[in-house]
């Protein structure tokens, strides 16, 4: 697999999405995990639904959320409030029983905000607006955001 | 397929004001950000500032502070750019240009520009 | 201002051979804030590598990306017909963003 940059600004949220063939992958969960150093295990950060059909619904772990497109074959992974630990190389996962095919590889970068804002309003990174139905899926450590909560480049 | 269509040519008097439109289809608009750079006749390109259409929130070059204005309009997936006190050098094609979801300063999906001429 | 400057300002080639465009930075950029694209006469610009070395979507392998502070360079491996046209590097480091003068890769 080739590695896929994806570069977000910190303190923005960054979202990182990843194509699969929908019929090769038909009821299969999907996953989203940190690769511990080059050779290391992949470490799961969050998972799609547990009923596949529900896959749809965003759900979180803290400022992670995953969400998956089953028919159209996207797989879509929010980073909110990226910092700089956040960086690094990540794998997006199909799961099938106690295997786990890889998707795409990802290296997130971390960009410093190079945008000067001295004579802008604050901006913010587009979100979509947080559903009932997204919120009944957060994890209990997340919290729900009101819409434009999450800042957008800054100015530099 | 995603694309992004721009108003028609425009010629302009010296003083005059110039609002040029970029309309979105094809993805989710308030998803990405926009920008706008220009290529004068002959020449290079010209970063003028960015738009976030989910909030319309905008950042400018400092160039064009208090000239250019940008705003857009969810309900039809539009963004425009205003640039007021116009002047010959302002003379020059006009694009807008999407964001990646890959890269947030760089421009993957471009507009097919709209040429503004100033003349008196 | 970053001010990013361009050499050579037009590149004589054949087909099949190897083109490398080279864009210096007035001042330091990471690698992470860079980005190539190419124009063809009466179109929009069409990008090609950002963060100096990671290719778009689309973009084939025969183009490569590469730098670091203030030197970067674009490597076109073997110039296929479709390549002739001019190139343009831009920095994202700061506000506000500006691009190189071109690179006119011409038909010899």
């Known amino acids: 697999h080739n590695t896929t940059v994806f570069q977000g600004v910190a303190g923005q949220s960054l979202q990182v999405s990843c194509p699969y063939d929908s019929m090769k992958h038909w009821g299969r969960r999907k996953a989203w995990c940190r690769q511990l150093g080059e050779k290391g295990p992949c470490q799961r950060v969050v998972s799609t639904h547990n009923l596949w059909l529900l896959s749809f619904l965003r759900r979180w772990n803290g400022s992670t959320a995953i969400t998956d497109d089953t028919l159209g074959g996207t797989l879509t992974i929010t980073l909110r409030n990226l910092q700089p630990h956040d960086a690094g190389l990540y794998q997006c996962q199909s799961l099938h029983g106690s295997e786990a095919d890889t998707l795409r590889k990802v290296l997130v970068e971390v960009l410093a905000d190079p945008l000067d804002h001295r004579d802008a309003g604050d901006l913010w990174f587009p979100g979509e607006s947080e559903s009932f139905e997204d919120a009944h899926v957060e994890h209990s450590i997340s919290r729900s955001l009101l819409e434009g909560e999450i800042p957008f480049p800054p100015t530099s | 397929q995603v694309q992004l269509v721009q108003s028609g040519a425009e010629v302009k008097k010296p003083g005059a004001s110039v609002k040029v439109s970029c309309k979105a289809s094809g993805y989710t608009f308030t998803s990405y950000y926009i920008h706008w750079v220009r290529q004068a006749p002959g020449q290079g390109l010209e970063w003028m500032g960015i738009?976030?259409?989910?909030?319309?929130?905008?950042s400018y070059a400092q160039k064009f502070q208090g000239r250019v204005t940008m705003t857009r309009d969810t309900s039809t997936s539009t963004v425009y750019m205003e640039l007021s006190s116009l002047r010959s050098e302002d003379t020059a094609v006009y694009y807008c240009?999407?964001?990646?979801?890959?890269?947030?300063?760089?421009?993957?999906?471009w507009g097919q520009g709209t040429m503004v001429t100033v003349s008196s | 201002e970053i001010v990013l400057t361009q050499s050579p300002g037009t590149l004589s080639l054949s087909p099949g051979e190897r083109a490398t465009l080279s864009c210096r930075a007035s001042?330091?950029?990471?690698?992470?804030?860079l980005a190539w694209y190419q124009q063809k006469p009466g179109q929009a610009p069409r990008l090609l590598i950002y963060?100096?070395?990671s290719r778009a979507t689309g973009i084939p392998d025969r183009f490569s990306g590469s730098g670091s502070g203030t030197d970067f360079t674009l490597t076109i491996s073997r110039l296929e017909p479709e390549d002739f046209a001019v190139y343009y590097c831009q920095q994202y480091a700061g506000s506000p963003f500006t691009f190189g003068g071109g690179t006119k890769v011409e038909i010899k």
């Open positions: 738009i976030n259409p989910s909030g319309g929130s905008t």
């Open positions: 001042q330091s950029v990471s690698s992470s804030y």
């Open positions: 963060g100096a070395s």
């Open positions: 240009a999407r964001a990646p979801q890959e890269s947030p300063y760089v421009f993957d999906i």
